[in-house]
Interface confidence: low
């Protein structure tokens, strides 16, 4: 496809999400001539670069080339030679790089630093590497749902996501969960805000929108096991941890410096008698919701409502799209339907986790045992936080959709973000010809 | 009981033109997309063309994209095909099915209506 | 475009038999795939959605699976009726793909 003539003008954006896991880099295009309308850039790849989140080479910074080279490469097979130059570049990274900021400023900014040279070195037109914040990252998931699911505007739309293809322009809400933190975005019924570090004004193809939004630090998936076991082992009475989030069965060996190693754990952090302990599985889910719980305080709440940690937390309203890890989890767990109840879900976690081990790795022989291990603390997590941390009823729970892509574009915030970056989000609603826009996001 | 029913097939000459409907029965027609699939004989399924609940989405193959135009009549619960300028390679088996994202994609289809194109 | 690519293209097996059919999407398609059988007049079923769902009346011997980009349709123990051919369809996004089909017999 690289020398073929285009039909019509194309042009395409590149952003790069360096999660706390992993990288993700995303290929967008849209057509030249309608690049303010809603519902037109859509996704034509996805990379994943090989290797943990950019946060773990900060003591291998000479590497992080390498590590990127696939997927830019990748980039460059797939946009025409044509439209390199003129194509942007955004790296995002996300709770990470704010964790490794917190524990060091100068260490985040080195590693920042060396992503940005190595993204230099392409033909493209590079715009920069940043450490999103966690408000933006909240903001730009619930804009890139909205944006592919046209409910920014009336016109017609080029892609279908049929249930939700109703006249009704009510925005979805947007549950993103990744690595480190996890974010909850969505517009209340209510328009004055009792936190205003929770609200956002957005004006959008002429309408506005009242958003609320938090980002959790240290309550994503991965950071949030951190979590669990650190508080769990502070009662354990030698270095042996019977871990009902994990299957009857399963065993693993844990460096207490790793333990400790992530901030999202220094409140946990006590001198043990030993410098390994072993988990070892019991499969059990209601052991292992009740063990979930105690990472969230509820006991204080400054505002009318809180989700958890005293943050404040408006009621719930509409429908909402929950993504990234959410849909990975819980699409493994195959409970993703509509169909299925809240009940349903957790009937089918608790007979999930009980599972043997040995059982578990026969039946899903092609998955890292890494990540299959932790699909039982990952289903349990996600239940807990929906239901007692964001307050999700077994009636409300319909009104969560668990969303991989939208007609082939991931949901995530990278779209939203390159959305706003290019002023492809005007303020005003576009007329029939292109207007000279001021005001976006 | 959901019912799609295809008709209208026949034998036509290359270059002529054909329209065929599905009548839907059994459910609610326009809370569905609906999609038209085609298998030419001893082939596979090829997909030919996706119209919304709405009719405001659309979508075709490529293999027929300019020739044949899906449309459709939520008050008469019927989907429409109108296929023109065909080629002998438009002959085959035209099945209609519905859809609705999650779990009801592509989950009912009709018996099919045969289309011959030849001289 | 995703390519689907679907193994065997026939299958001679025998009632009881397990047989296994495979797809391999050639873009990730995140699960969105449905598995299709169709019988000799021409009658299209759907078996599966979402890679591993089975739908309402169809009997437990038929199951889906995933492995990162490879799905696979397993039936159990073979009966006379699941002689038949087989289809699996990507709807990750447009435009839909079939895989080439698999025509399962009795030997």
């Known amino acids: 496809t690289q020398n073929k003539a285009l039909p019509e003008n194309i042009k395409y954006g590149i952003v790069l999400d360096a999660g706390s896991s992993h990288t993700s880099l995303y290929i967008y295009k849209w057509p030249a001539e309608k690049e303010n309308d809603t519902g037109v850039v859509h996704q034509v790849e996805e990379c994943r670069v090989k290797g943990p989140g950019i946060s773990k080479y900060v003591q291998k910074v000479n590497e992080i080339g390498i590590y990127l080279t696939d997927c830019m490469e990748r980039a460059r097979e797939v946009i025409p030679r044509s439209q390199h130059q003129e194509t942007p570049v955004y790296l995002g990274a996300t709770a990470g790089m704010r964790l490794l900021r917190m524990e060091s400023e100068e260490l985040a900014d080195r590693v920042l630093d060396v992503v940005e040279r190595s993204l230099s070195n392409y033909p493209f037109d590079f715009q920069g590497a940043r450490i999103i914040t966690g408000q933006e990252e909240g903001a730009y998931g619930w804009i890139t749902i909205n944006y592919l699911l046209g409910k920014f505007s009336q016109k017609t739309r080029w892609f279908s996501i049929v249930p939700y293809e109703t006249n009704n322009q009510e925005t979805f809400g947007a549950l993103d969960l990744g690595g480190a933190s996890t974010q909850i975005t969505f517009v209340p019924q209510n328009q004055t805000t009792e936190s205003p570090d929770n609200a956002l004004q957005f004006r959008l193809y002429g309408k506005d929108y009242n958003v609320y939004t938090h980002s959790f630090l240290c309550y994503g998936k991965d950071q949030a096991l951190w979590q669990k076991l650190a508080k769990d082992i502070q009662v354990a009475s030698n270095e042996i941890l019977r871990d009902p989030c994990f299957h009857p069965g399963y065993k693993k060996v844990v460096n207490v410096s790793d333990l400790y190693k992530t901030p999202c754990t220094k409140r946990f952090e006590m001198t043990l008698p030993f410098q390994q302990f072993e988990i070892q599985g019991i499969g059990n889910y209601q052991q292992c919701h009740q063990s979930v719980l105690e990472l969230f305080n509820t006991s204080y709440c400054p505002y009318s409502q809180c989700a958890f940690n005293g943050i404040f937390l408006p009621p719930l309203q509409g429908d909402f799209g929950a993504f990234s890890a959410f849909y990975f989890v819980m699409n493994f767990l195959n409970l993703t339907s509509e169909k299925v109840s809240q009940e349903k879900v957790t009937e089918m976690m608790k007979k999930f986790c009980s599972q043997p081990w040995e059982e578990i790795k026969t039946s899903y022989a092609g998955v890292k045992e890494k990540y299959l291990s932790e699909y039982c603390f990952s289903g349990t997590y996600i239940l807990s936080l929906l239901l007692q941390g964001y307050h999700f009823t077994a009636d409300s729970w319909e009104h969560i959709h668990f969303i991989g892509k939208i007609q082939g574009s991931d949901a995530g915030w990278t779209l939203g973000y390159m959305l706003n970056l290019t002023n492809m989000i005007p303020a005003e609603q576009p007329l029939s010809t292109p207007l000279s826009h001021s005001t976006y996001v | 009981e959901v019912q799609l029913v295809e008709s209208g097939g026949g034998l036509v000459k290359p270059g002529g033109s054909l329209k065929l409907p599905c009548a839907a029965s059994g459910f609610t027609f326009s809370d569905y997309g609906m999609h038209w699939v085609r298998q030419a004989p001893e082939k596979g399924l090829e997909w030919v063309a996706y119209i919304s609940s709405g009719s405001s989405i659309i979508y075709y193959a490529d293999t027929v994209k300019g020739r044949f135009t899906i449309s459709r009549d939520n008050a008469k619960n019927t989907l429409f095909l109108q296929m023109t300028s065909l080629r002998s390679e438009d002959t085959a088996m035209y099945y209609c099915?519905?859809?609705?994202?999650?779990?009801?994609?592509?989950?009912?289809w009709g018996q099919g209506t045969t289309l011959t194109v030849a001289s | 475009d995703i390519q689907m690519t679907q193994s065997p293209s026939s299958l001679s097996a025998s009632l009881g038999e397990r047989v296994s059919l495979t797809c391999r999407a050639s873009?990730?398609?995140?699960?969105?795939l449905i598995w299709l059988q169709q019988k000799p007049d021409g009658t299209i079923k759907r078996l599966i959605y979402?890679?591993?769902t089975l739908d309402s009346g169809v009997p437990k011997r038929f199951s889906g699976n995933r492995s990162g980009s490879d799905y696979s349709l397993t039936i159990s123990s073979l009966e006379s009726e699941d002689f038949a051919d087989y289809y699996c369809?990507?709807?990750?996004?447009?435009?839909?793909?079939f895989g080439g089909g698999t025509k399962l017999e009795i030997k």
């Open positions: 369809l990507q709807y990750a996004s447009y435009p839909r793909t």
């Open positions: 099915a519905r859809d609705l994202y999650y779990d009801h994609v592509l989950d009912y």
């Open positions: 979402a890679a591993s």
């Open positions: 873009q990730e398609i995140s699960g969105y």
